[in-house]
């Protein structure tokens, strides 16, 4: 069992769905959970988040926001084999850019 | 802090239907996956049913399959169990519970009674 | 899907140390080491005391100790006290977002 490189970053905007994929060789029904390592607390220990959510071990987080940074980590697992570990990829949420003043209505403008 | 408020319990009759909520606040919701946990009265507990973080895996005890649907609303940060067909053995303190690791949070429960 | 095995209940003194076990397969522990250990004090939910198999939150006693060998978890508690009187459950990921606990073990402190 090995794994495939994972991204180092994934940049995700405010409100946006993050998709973190966990590459890996196996062709078994192999057991893939999710951890995170807080941002700004990379001494604690990583937080299990739960599995993956189809056969390629994918973790999607719905709606991010600031609180959901840090670093995400995959594990697999075949039977009762030690587990293999990915590098990390590191959450980045980005604020949106603010809708610039030409968006406005002409109305709005006008006030 | 981490809040995890269970809602929905009661006195239902063999073969009835209850739905219970548990509304979670102070915690990355959308991230971890969910669970129930249940505990009869004077028994041990037991886990019932699981969700992944944005609800495409299900996971249900043999005991409830096919009579329990586990969902979750992260735009509400809410999750659900919709109880169908409950028999008497289904009677219990039901607990919502984010498992494993250091961040590992339980409500307070909501008993459900099953009783003509 | 069946119950972790511990025993039904444990006893000791004031001051002494005892020691609770909990046996699965090797399906239930894996190589994730996603073992939990729970006091329940009468009405009250579940408190964490042990996770990960060894480690201890913060807030809890280092009178707590975990460990596991194979297929076997133990909670240990040194220097008994009145208050340690509860029941204990072990709990282990099962793959999925499933999990499998223990029976649970009645603690009597004597005296």
């Known amino acids: 069992l090995w794994m495939h490189k994972v991204p180092a970053s994934l940049m995700v905007s405010l409100g946006e769905d993050a998709h973190f994929q966990c590459p890996h060789n196996s062709s078994n029904n192999a057991n893939v959970t999710w951890w995170r390592v807080l941002h700004g607390n990379y001494t604690w220990p990583p937080e299990f988040l739960g599995p993956g959510e189809d056969p390629n071990g994918t973790l999607i987080i719905q709606n991010v926001n600031k609180s959901h940074g840090g670093i995400y980590v995959c594990r697999v697992q075949e039977g009762n084999e030690s587990y293999q570990q990915s590098c990390g990829t590191y959450l980045r949420v980005r604020q949106p850019p603010p809708r610039p003043f030409l968006d406005m209505g002409e109305g709005t403008k006008n006030r | 802090e981490v809040q995890l408020l269970e809602s929905g319990g009661g006195l239902v009759q063999p073969g009835g239907s209850l739905r219970l909520s548990c509304a979670a606040s102070?915690?990355?919701?959308?991230?971890?996956?969910m669970n129930w946990v249940r505990q009869a009265p004077g028994k041990g507990l037991e886990w019932v049913s699981g969700?992944?973080?944005?609800?495409?895996?299900?996971y249900y005890a043999d005991s409830v399959k096919g009579r329990f649907t586990i969902s979750r609303d992260n735009s509400k940060n809410t999750l659900y169990l919709q109880m169908n067909s409950l028999r008497a053995e289904d009677t219990a303190v039901y607990y919502c519970?984010?498992?494993?690791?250091?961040?590992?949070?339980w409500g307070q429960g909501t008993l459900v009674t099953v009783s003509s | 899907q069946s119950a972790l095995t511990q025993p039904a209940s444990v006893s000791g003194s004031p001051g002494q140390s005892i020691t609770i076990s909990c046996t699965g397969t090797s399906s239930d522990f894996g190589s994730y080491n996603l073992v939990s250990w729970y006091q329940q004090h009468p009405g009250k939910a579940p408190k964490l005391m042990i996770y990960?198999?060894?480690k201890r939150p913060s807030g809890v006693s280092n009178r707590f100790s975990g460990s596991k060998s194979g297929n076997t978890a133990s909670l240990t508690i040194s220097g008994l006290q009145a208050e340690d009187e509860a029941d204990y459950y072990c709990c282990s990921y099962a793959g999925g977002s499933t999990w499998v606990f223990g029976g649970g073990t009645k603690l009597t402190v004597l005296g």
């Open positions: 519970a984010k498992l494993g690791g250091w961040s590992d949070y």
């Open positions: 990960e198999g060894s």
């Open positions: 969700i992944s973080g944005s609800g495409g895996g299900t």
């Open positions: 102070g915690l990355t919701f959308t991230s971890y996956a």
